[in-house]
């Protein structure tokens, strides 16, 4: 079963810009990636980017750029005003959902200030059985 990882990286020189990196370890066919956050602006989950292997990427503010970093990992860059960034991000959790075959959906989340290595145990949101 694939393991999903998430890391959030603040830019050292620009406190209003940071990146969410996430990927899947192991052998699986990725059909869709959704990057979202919780606790930012309101209590609900905010979709930041959707990345499709063939049809490209789509992102929503405050996401500035979303792209594939490798065949099994993505990166989303976010930009916002510095004062807003400091106040909003303290309680924000970033989540990445990888829809893979044949393992189904795998989600991992982490917050901006967590200091562990960044490997999160995958939580199956949906299990699809292979034929």
């Amino acid at each position: 079963s694939p393991e999903v990882w998430v890391q959030v990286q603040m830019e050292a020189t620009n406190l209003s810009s940071f990146s969410v990196h996430c990927g899947v370890l192991g052998y699986s066919l990725i059909s869709l990636v959704t990057v979202s956050c919780e606790g930012f602006v309101d209590a609900g989950r905010t979709k930041l980017a959707v990345l499709h292997p063939e049809f490209g990427t789509q992102q929503w503010a405050p996401a500035r750029q979303a792209h594939w970093e490798t065949p099994n990992s993505v990166s989303v860059t976010l930009t916002m005003g510095q004062s807003k960034a400091r106040s909003s991000l303290a309680n924000t959790t970033f989540c990445c959902e990888f829809v893979t075959f044949p393992h189904g959906s795998r989600v991992a989340c982490r917050d901006l200030h967590r200091s562990d290595p960044g490997l999160s145990a995958p939580t199956p949101a949906l299990n699809l059985q292979a034929d």
Epitope: S28, E54, N72
Partner: antibody
Framework: QVQLVQSGAEVKKPGSSVKVSCKAS????????ISWVRQAPGQGLEWMGG????????NYAQKFQGRVTITADESTSTAYMELSSLRSEDTAVYYC????????????????WGQGTLVTVSS | DIQMTQSPSSLSASVGDRVTITCRAS??????LNWYQQKPGKAPKLLIY???SLQSGVPSRFSGSGSGTDFTLTISSLQPEDFATYYC????????FGGGTKVEIK
């Protein structure tokens, strides 16, 4: 124009480890993954694994899982591949290569490549 | 793992010949297929990416086609510098290379 320069040839004893370096120059290092590929004498190419220097997460081919460790030092723009428990079958040229892609789709390829490092395992 | 099978494993041809190398994937890989050329003692060189896109600086006599499981590399008119070994590579699930095709002088 990015260039990848690898460390020199190594001769190792069976059971030992080897660590090969790959230094990038002439471009951004952190945002591009570096893969390691090996080629035994007279044989084909074999992908071992790769790493995204930022955030430093590596992915490995199942065959090498547990025996290979790929790391990267962003401050020196250098990637490393360490292979442990060496045996004679590990005698090969080891290449590093940059995973290059369009970004907006999942298409990736290897370009450029390092010059290769010959690792000889012999008692 | 996805297996990549190249054929033929070797071929003999003359300058000016049209050469075709095929690569078959053990499962559908869409167009996640690259082609490389390697000469003895040298690192591989990218020729074609995403099944049919010609890498910058590569002569137009090289072309790639195919999708799904079957792919082809064609050299329209073989030149002396084209005698080398050619590898296909899938990038759909991690990376796997084909076994290689050695193009030799007839």
């Amino acid at each position: 124009q990015v260039q990848l320069v690898q460390s020199g040839a190594e001769v190792k004893k069976p059971g030992s480890s080897v660590k090969v370096s790959c230094k990038a120059s002439g471009g951004t290092f952190g945002n591009y993954a570096i893969s390691w590929v090996r080629q035994a004498p007279g044989q084909g190419l074999e992908w071992m694994g790769g790493i995204i220097p930022i955030p430093g997460i590596a992915n490995y081919a199942q065959k090498f899982q547990g025996r290979v460790t790929i790391t990267a030092d962003e401050s020196t723009s250098t990637a490393y591949m360490e292979l442990s428990s060496l045996r004679s079958e590990d005698t090969a040229v080891y290449y590093c290569a940059r995973d290059t892609g369009r970004g907006y789709t999942r298409h990736f390829w290897f370009d450029p490549w390092g010059q290769g490092t010959l690792v000889t395992v012999s008692s | 793992d996805i297996q990549m099978t190249q054929s033929p494993s070797s071929l003999s041809a003359s300058v000016g010949d049209r050469v075709t190398i095929t690569c078959r994937a053990s499962q559908s890989i869409s167009s996640y297929l690259n082609w490389y050329q390697q000469k003895p003692g040298k690192a591989p060189k990218l020729l074609i990416y995403a099944a049919s896109s010609l890498q910058s600086g590569v002569p137009s006599r090289f072309s790639g086609s195919g999708s799904g499981t079957d792919f082809t590399l064609t050299i329209s008119s073989l030149q002396p510098e084209d005698f080398a070994t050619y590898y296909c590579q899938q990038s759909d699930i991690l990376y796997t290379f084909g076994g290689g095709t050695k193009v030799e002088i007839k």
